[in-house]
Interface confidence: low
């Protein structure tokens, strides 16, 4: 009783809610609920009955596996889904799936809050701006990740001439997606293009893709 599985998916995707074990043999009835009491679909006597709910037309039940297919999930579909099976013995068995639907993160914009010469070095303060989202931040200097303690929306650092990074990337991510924003500087302490506040990867002519999928995979497993 009360098996709970967590699932996180991206909004707009098609989702399969299913259990990892076989259904009880020759069960009498199978019902999927949205929250605790709102029925979505019920299988009984070899046919499925779909109830009036916001899922009507978007769900399909596979009675053999018990899987519930939901198309084009939205954030409003966040909930705990319950599958109840009535066995031939009259006992009920229940499985729960907590579904979290997240929107893909938007592309961040990097703002240069402060850039100044200091003790022959370069003091830099950057902020990574995205519209009101709950995300994780990772900063990279020329592909190398800054320490995890700096994973917030503001990066401040003092660059020495010998370890000067040219391009700074803010990667914003949630469980389902990630996007990068990049800004580049010229030594000793100036924007790469003085007339532009922000230089994106596109502005670099596509020559320099700062972070590859492989790099990201490697960095996340440090």
């Amino acid at each position: 009783q009360g098996h709970l599985v967590h699932m996180t998916v991206v909004s707009g995707s098609n989702v399969t809610l299913n259990i990892s074990e076989s259904l009880p043999e020759n069960y009498k009835q199978l019902t999927w609920f949205y929250t605790f009491d709102q029925k979505i679909v019920e299988w009984d006597s070899r046919k499925s009955k779909y109830f009036e709910s916001k899922f009507k037309g978007r769900v399909r039940l596979d009675p053999q596996s018990g899987a519930l297919y939901i198309s084009k999930v939205q954030k409003e579909d966040n909930s705990t889904y319950i599958m109840r099976v009535l066995k031939k013995t009259g006992n009920e068995q229940e499985w729960k799936i907590k579904l979290q639907v997240l929107d893909p993160v938007p592309k961040p914009v990097i703002k240069i809050e402060k850039i100044e010469d200091m003790d022959d070095n370069c003091y830099l303060k950057l902020s990574c701006v995205i519209p009101g989202e709950s995300v994780n931040y990772t900063w990279y200097g020329d592909k190398r990740p800054f320490p995890k303690e700096l994973q917030n929306s503001v990066l401040e650092t003092t660059l020495m001439p010998h370890n000067y990074s040219r391009c700074y990337t803010c990667q914003v991510s949630n469980s389902v997606s990630s996007k990068n924003g990049t800004v580049c500087l010229s030594p000793p302490c100036t924007l790469a293009r003085s007339e532009q506040k922000l230089i994106s990867e596109e502005d670099l002519g596509g020559e320099q893709k700062l972070i590859s999928e492989e790099d990201l995979h490697h960095h996340h497993h440090h």
């Epitope: 190398r144 990740p145 303690e149 003092t158 020495m160 440090h222």
Partner: antibody, heavy 118, light 108 residues
């Protein structure tokens, strides 16, 4: 010339508290991340804590999390480490160090000895 | 976290000899972000090498660093009396920054 001078160490009973200070000179203090690194008697170096230049970001080693607090007063060019609930295993020489671009430590102060004993 | 293992633990040598100290990482240190420090008794550590092979300001050229990935080396081409000390490696390619346990170079 960059100089870092620690103070505030001493003998304290288990469960007690201490506040270490590190006075900095010779550089624009508020522009640089700073760190505390400790060394138990006869042992190696262990990174303890980090604070960004403005003081907005702090980070701690798991061994001191919840017990130590790093903070700074940029107007006084001083770095601090507030230590509470001290344990015998916190006994060490505590060094403050300037963090070079969040990479390595250069330079270091001369250290201050903390002894936790009953 | 990345664990750094230094070997040998202690080296007994005479002035004028060549020294090779090893630092091995439990996983690859990205872009050779490795530093070496020297510590003499009663003193604070001093930065010798950063970026695996770049000498810090004021460090004599008898000190050199090399290596990449998981294997790094600090070489002292000709030991001077003031070089007898403990040497530590430190990686800064990933968080948290970690140190090796140290190698002591003592007079034979």
């Amino acid at each position: 010339e960059v100089q870092l001078l620690e103070s505030g160490g001493g003998l304290v009973h288990p469960g007690g508290s201490l506040r270490l200070s590190c006075a900095a000179s010779g550089f624009t203090f508020g522009g640089y991340a700073m760190s505390w690194v400790r060394q138990a008697p006869g042992k190696g170096l262990e990174w303890v804590s980090l604070i960004s230049g403005s003081g907005g970001s702090t980070y701690y080693a798991d061994s001191v999390k919840g017990r130590f607090t790093i903070f700074r007063d940029n107007s006084k060019n001083t770095l601090y480490l507030q230590m509470i609930s001290l344990r015998a295993e916190d006994s060490a020489v505590y060094y403050c160090a300037k963090y070079s671009n969040y990479d390595y430590f250069d330079p270091w102060g001369q250290g201050t000895l903390v002894t936790v004993s009953s | 976290e990345i664990v750094l293992t230094q070997s040998p633990g202690t080296l007994s040598l005479s002035p004028g000899e060549r020294v090779t100290l090893s630092c091995r990482a439990s996983q690859s240190v990205s872009s050779s972000y490795l530093a070496w420090y020297q510590q003499k008794p009663g003193q604070a550590p001093r930065l010798l090498i950063y970026g695996a092979s770049s000498r810090a300001t004021g460090i004599p050229d008898r000190f050199s660093g090399s290596g990449s990935g998981t294997d790094f080396t600090l070489t002292i081409s000709r030991l001077e009396p003031e070089d007898f000390a403990v040497y530590y490696c430190q990686q800064y390619g990933s968080s948290p920054r970690t140190f090796g346990q140290g190698t002591k170079v003592e007079i034979k």
